[in-house]
Amino acid sequence: ALLPAREATQFLRPRQRRAFQVFEEAKQGHLERECVEELCSREEAREVFENDPETDYFYPRYLDCINKYGSPYTKNSGFATCVQNLPDQCTPNPCDRKGTQACQDLMGNFFCLCKAGWGGRLCDKDVNECSQENGGCLQICHNKPGSFHCSCHSGFELSSDGRTCQDIDECADSEACGEARCKNLPGSYSCLCDEGFAYSSQEKACRDVDECLQGRCEQVCVNSPGSYTCHCDGRGGLKLSQDMDTCEDILPCVPFSVAKSVKSLYLGRMFSGTPVIRLRFKRLQPTRLVAEFDFRTFDPEGILLFAGGHQDSTWIVLALRAGRLELQLRYNGVGRVTSSGPVINHGMWQTISVEELARNLVIKVNRDAVMKIAVAGDLFQPERGLYHLNLTVGGIPFHEKDLVQPINPRLDGCMRSWNWLNGEDTTIQETVKVNTRMQCFSVTERGSFYPGSGFAFYSLDYMRTPLDVGTESTWEVEVVAHIRPAADTGVLFALWAPDLRAVPLSVALVDYHSTKKLKKQLVVLAVEHTALALMEIKVCDGQEHVVTVSLRDGEATLEVDGTRGQSEVSAAQLQERLAVLERHLRSPVLTFAGGLPDVPVTSAPVTAFYRGCMTLEVNRRLLDLDEAAYKHSDITAHSCPPVEPAAA
């Protein structure tokens, strides 16, 4: 077996020392005679040691002993000891006690024989076994004075060979992760939680991460177990972007022909039913009313014009009822109502005229007389030497209940080429020219147009009391919406509970799936903020789509173009949500079309205003926007611009 050089010399050295031993003892006796009992010179000392190195080492120290203890002749025992120890360079032992196996005296020198793990001339230097091949350890080598040992990283244990390591399976301990899932890893383990949860080592449980604290959302953030949702100010015209965190503008995806005609007058601008135009005519010369104009509407009911004095005097009102012209008149306190002529709410232009003759009023449609009414008196009434006539368009100057026969005054109609009293009317033309809200869409179709800037609401009751008294009242919400959307986000229909400021029910267009965080064009049916059902819709195809919603005790369905939507809740959750809805329906609720009031963005999945055409049928009754409790003035109740034809 071959040994490294250092170990070989250490193995051989003790044998060498034994060979010298005889000479050493002889040398010691010779020294006694020559230099202890007598005073010796350098030459004499040379004879004792028989070599220069030992002599050179010995003699100066010999002189030191004389200086210290006196000459040999003084017989000082300290001198003898001093001299006798000089040639043995291992006395006193120069080698490190801890690291030395033996000290070997050499000619004027010494040699420290080191124990294993020690080195250096004096065996005082620790040998770092770890510096070569990691001391043979697989993972960690620990050097120690004169030794070393192997150890393992956390999660590993030392094998019986003292050098290799093996992985500890911490997951074998069922308590390692508590409620969380445990995954063993080389030298470690991990406690795993579902996405949106983080492991708490103190509680040994998965705890929800509040992503909202990380400021992920641009606007409103709602944390939920394991997730979060961002919300944007829908009423402010914003929706979630592709990243589901930031907000972007809701932009039209279908261009509607919303160009307006500067030479037209829109009669439906004032939801209050107040006139859009008020004219006062005054003459010194007695004058008769002559009014002529072109008119277009799809609206079946409303007021075209009023002419006369105050409500108790003499006046006429030209109106529409069930699509036909109606003339209400009051002369000297006596009221009458006459209706005649063809249905004219077909959306095409026609010329209408009202002419006051000596004893008659003549109403013409396209130059054909449809009404001729005998009257006793004049519409221009004298007052302080002047004849007065008030003429209002699109409304009356008093409350509709004071008419001969009450009528809904709101009329979504359009006038052009008007002529009042055969006069040149630059005043109205100038006013209309600078005010686009007074102008009509150049082209219209049937329907109602929601411009994405407002809503209408109604006060409707959804509770039904059965005929058999004593039984519990039931409830039902059935909505059919015919829509031609211009944008991909907006509230079609909603119920609002003013007392609780909650949104018990909403049906809306949305362009993302909130839980899957996926961009997708959908119709969402929700109770409060919880989606009950979703259905895909091709919202930007410019086509009409039918959205049907049916909710009653125990069931909720959503259909788009006859295809049923997918439920987003369990049967138990559905029952709980329907119970919430029913509770709301027992209190006062308002029915909203095309948007929501100023509610928190978290009240419903969508808060944005709807943009596009829509007609709503609620519980088998067509909603007439003229009958609403409130309607935004930019919503056109009975007309809708068409989709712009695609550019060639």
């Epitope: 005054k282 003459r283 010194l284 010369q285 007695p286 302080r384 030497g385 002047l386 055969n422």
Partner: antibody, heavy 116, light 107 residues
């Protein structure tokens, strides 16, 4: 386009008579009465009265009753103002103006100077 | 007869100045007040008709207010073309009556 065109200026001696005209165009003449307004040099405006273009009936303010006559010729859609026995204080510009309760359309004015 | 007292009879202003002319009536005329501008050698031009209605083509620097017996015509920032005579006219009752007029001159 509605226009009222008056006859030219007149220089008259006191005691003489003058008849000025106001030709209307651009509208139905008989639908609107015709007013007359006086403006003495450096003075304000004074309403003299009006004439019913349907019936020809004139109405004068107190100050202009007597020597002043409003008349019509509907066939030529023209109104007239005649002043008899002219006085120095009749020196003024006379305007015709269409009746609308107020006055929107005016003639350009006719200056009558009464001087001996 | 309703008499109209117009003031001031004249005023000197610089271009850009605000001008206010008042007209006080002897009877309540509701809002049946009209305002005219007249330039030398020209007929009066209607600026504002009954009900404080600005006439078509009249610049928005002209405005009026008032009802009952106190009426005001305001020129918010006088322009060179605004130097002229201004008259009020009541059309509430016959006889129709004008104010004495206000001359707006360049300072």
């Amino acid at each position: 386009q509605i226009h009222l065109v008056q006859s030219g200026p007149e220089l008259k001696k006191p005691g003489a008579s003058v008849k000025i005209s106001c030709k209307a165009s651009g509208y139905t003449f008989t639908n609107y009465g015709m007013n007359w307004v006086k403006q003495a040099p450096g003075q304000g405006l004074k309403w003299m009265g009006w004439i019913n273009t349907n019936t020809g009936e004139p109405t004068y303010t107190e100050e202009f009753k007597g020597r002043f006559v409003f008349s019509l010729d509907t066939s030529v859609t023209t109104a007239y103002l005649q002043i008899s026995t002219l006085k120095a204080e009749d020196t003024a510009t006379y305007f015709c103006a269409r009746d609308e309760g107020w006055f929107v359309y005016w003639g350009q004015g006719t200056l009558i100077t009464v001087s001996s | 007869e309703t008499t109209l007292t117009q003031s001031p009879s004249s005023l000197s202003v610089s271009t850009g100045d605000r001008v206010t002319i008042t007209c006080i009536t002897s009877t309540d005329i509701d809002d049946d007040m009209n305002w005219y501008q007249q330039k030398p050698g020209k007929p009066p031009k209607l600026l504002i008709s009954e009900g404080n209605t600005l006439r078509p083509g009249v610049p928005s620097r002209f405005s009026s207010s008032g009802s009952g017996t106190d009426f005001t015509l305001t020129i918010s920032s006088t322009q060179p073309e605004d130097f002229a005579d201004y008259y009020c006219l009541q059309t509430d009752s016959v006889p129709l009556t004008f104010g004495q007029g206000t001359k707006v001159e360049i300072k």
